[in-house]
Interface confidence: low
Amino acid sequence: LNLAYPISPWKFKLFCGPPNTTDDSFLSPAGAPNNASALKGASEAIVEAKFNSSGIYVPELSKTVFHCCFGNEQGQNCSALTDNTEGKTLASVVKASVFRQLGVNWDIECWMKGDLTLFICHMEPLPKNPFKNYDSKVHLLYDLPEVIDDSPLPPLKDSFQTVQCNCSLRGCECHVPVPRAKLNYALLMYLEITSAGVSFQSPLMSLQPMLVVKPDPPLGLHMEVTDDGNLKISWDSQTMAPFPLQYQVKYLENSTIVREAAEIVSATSLLVDSVLPGSSYEVQVRSKRLDGSGVWSDWSSPQVFTTQDVVYFPPKILTSVGSNASFHCIYKNENQIISSKQIVWWRNLAEKIPEIQYSIVSDRVSKVTFSNLKATRPRGKFTYDAVYCCNEQACHHRYAELYVIDVNINISCETDGYLTKMTCRWSPSTIQSLVGSTVQLRYHRRSLYCPDSPSIHPTSEPKNCVLQRDGFYECVFQPIFLLSGYTMWIRINHSLGSLDSPPTCVLPDSVVKPLPPSNVKAEITVNTGLLKVSWEKPVFPENNLQFQIRYGLSGKEIQWKTHEVFDAKSKSASLLVSDLCAVYVVQVRCRRLDGLGYWSNWSSPAYTLVMDVKVPMRGPEFWRKMDGDVTKKERNVTLLWKPLTKNDSLCSVRRYVVKHRTAHNGTWSEDVGNRTNLTFLWTEPAHTVTVLAVNSLGASLVNFNLTFSWPMSKVSAVESLSAYPLSSSCVILSWTLSPDDYSLLYLVIEWKILNEDDGMKWLRIPSNVKKFYIHDNFIPIEKYQFSLYPVFMEGVGKPKIINGFTKDAIDKQQNDAG
């Protein structure tokens, strides 16, 4: 059985040269496991042997292969490596004695690359090597059989693959690709070196690639002063490595004292105690498998960190409103560290910080603490407060930076009426002063309901939010879980660290903005005269809903009135309105009865139609115009009335009907249509007329009567009548009445331009009034006639008529006006 020599762990010397024996026999590459067993377990010891290669080109030996062996530093006992079982010499035999005194030493180092893709062997000739590297041709022959019971199967010569090694002045390098799946297989290999026409062949070697990994040097080496004044050296963890690593850190501190150290750690950071001002630290780090196998990586490139004469730790603080923050300081002045008792603190070099906020951490470390911090207000381009550590005489120009941000960001969420998505909105206005920050909404969904107290969950997800024109961010959750508790907060990321706004938990089911009620109808009900509003509730949510109705007179500026409906089963409501004959605009909205969530948008407006809702409230007020001779028993009477208003007609007049009643002819009616006057012949001593208004629902029930009576027309109840012009638009009428035996119903004032038949105007006045202001356009150059008629139950009395204004008693007129 040919046994391969185990390489332990990864660095060795080979001796190739003339052996001390005359045995001419040729041995194929073989190993000596028993004698090497002591080496196998030595994980740290470097196995060294000499690869001593004989020295000159000898043509007749060009076909000869010289076999090498592992040797010690002196090249002695190379031939003594024997197989215990068979006692055969494993050293190579070379016929020519010319090589007996000559030899070449080779240093060989092999490792598995950190990214686990290549196995690399690096060879360098030791000094006094008669062969030139660049003349050399080096091949590495290898096989990767699967390991069974920790011992490789005997290698078959045909199974070996060859790689050519790249040689340069410095040495040769051989690259063997190792599939990831075979990292734990046994790599069997030997080297063939041809130089100056002479070939050398190493013994067969074996190793497991995974056990000789040389990681890449650690990256991201950086240093910072910690909050407690130590130097923290840290580097990135090598996440790609499939095994844990250990690290060796070496650093040199140059300050008042010189410290040099190399420490091995398994963490990715190391604290150097007590950083000093005005010092420099040079640091390097390398890595190796934690279990001790494999090769140390190369050292990382050196990093230098220099501390200033004033050391602040931390140098910058980013924190939130209401929190507390502390800075520490060590002050070195003219190579002397100032006692912490002599340190004073200033803010923005404008305000000395009260000493109650100082504390002495140690002889040389002073600390200042700010409590319940308020947001820093930007001062010009500075968005922070500068905190200065000073000695009693002066302040150093360096300062610490304090950024205090108001992170109380309100997040409001709304679930749409279809219950398919939840939209959350928030404004970053309070944090815009923090330049270089990014904001992100983060959330954690709890399967059911919100926790008692929402807290920032360690496993959270970011939510993509879009900045809107109004300066708010909008984030949409879709799909949603209605009964899940979404705890969310805003994370402000900055190079100084991250801040989180106070978390809030939202249950999509509790922030629903329902769809507005649909099919909204509005009408003024017949007879009852109420505004009846009806609607259909939205399909979602299924909770009980409350409704709110808003209604108002249709127009440009609607004066809305609202009405609440708390009965979830209601689909309609009847409201009292003042104007039954106006167009009302009505909208309805809804929200959950328990008060959760939001009001829906208002429904699309519904409008009432103006329709007759009751019979007219009353017939029109009317008066008459008389034609013909007063002495004659027949006179033309023209009845005049003003069109009934909507509020009196409720809401329209289809026609007017005049009812006549006389002693002789009894009662009869005349349909006037929509005219507002009627002329009839008054032929009897008494003739009573009533004007009714008729709409689609019927005739007015309350109406005005007027009786034309010959005897009553002679009854003179008005003693005096005066007219005083107050202005061109107002005339004051005053009168006195004489006591009589008739019941006076009311008075009628008539006025017109004298000597004109048309243009008569009239007003009905209560019987108890003694003075009245007539508002009209009075033309100053015209003469007016004013008449005052007493109207009795029994008929119209005799008028008092005056032509023109009363010229005397202007004073009286003014007194009366007052």
Partner: antibody
């Protein structure tokens, strides 16, 4: 030793307010939910509400909402329960009890493992 | 009226096993495995015997066990002893993140 010590017995008139205290020791008071439970004479236990001192927010059983206020003072490790508009049916023994689960685990899930000795409250005119 | 329903009383002889049921709804017992059981001797504060449905705090005898099926939780006491005579209350976490109790069960050891 983990323990909760409550204030002494109280006699109140209807309409008055009641405030009882519960001081914790032997554990990190801030991080545990402190509950208040009452038991009327001859009746069962009734959960009133609870507070997590570190957050300072309380939640209450619907029955007591608006009438009970639970507070906590971290500096003295003391929880308080105030009940207003007392009526005769508020006569009971009032217990404070600690949740066995430390925040931020779901509070209320683990049961109440440490109880105060109880405060007897009598409401009578 | 209590939200969770327990039998008013149960009894058993020493050495026997008894079971006390506690019925709720999907909003409390049925929705969570957060049922706890308390033992209360007259004039004393309650003592936690079972939490999270079936877990025993240290110091509680393994004769006490809890289980749940649907919206009903159960407390079983095996090998009944005289000192087990007490009132037993179940309690559950609810969807409203509050706690509710059962009306209590008086256990008599005959």
């Amino acid at each position: 030793e983990v323990q909760l010590v409550q204030s002494g017995a109280e006699v109140k008139k209807p309409g008055e307010s009641l405030k009882i205290s519960c001081q914790g020791s032997g554990f990190t008071f801030s991080s545990y939910k402190m509950n208040w439970v009452r038991q009327a004479p001859g009746k069962g236990l009734e959960w009133m509400g609870g507070i997590i001192p570190i957050f300072g927010t309380a939640n209450y059983a619907q029955k007591f909402q608006g009438r009970v206020t639970i507070t906590a003072d971290e500096s003295t490790s003391t929880a308080y329960m105030e009940l207003s508009s007392l009526r005769s049916e508020d006569t009971a023994v009032y217990y404070c009890a600690r949740d066995r689960v430390v925040v931020p685990a779901t509070s209320l899930r683990g049961g109440m493992d440490v109880w105060g000795q109880g405060t007897t409250v009598t409401v009578s005119s | 009226q209590s939200v969770l329903t327990q039998p008013a009383s149960v009894s058993g002889s020493p050495g026997q096993s008894i079971t006390i049921s506690c019925t709720g709804t999907s909003s409390d017992v049925g929705g969570y495995n957060y049922v706890s059981w308390y033992q209360q001797h007259p004039g004393k504060a309650p003592k936690l015997m079972i939490y999270e449905g079936s877990k025993r705090p240290s110091g509680v005898s393994n004769r006490f066990s809890g289980s749940k099926s649907g919206s009903t939780a159960s407390l079983t006491i095996s090998g009944l002893q005289a000192e087990d005579e007490a009132d037993y209350y179940c309690s559950s976490y609810t969807t409203r993140s509050t706690r509710v109790f059962g009306g209590g069960t008086k256990l008599t050891v005959l």
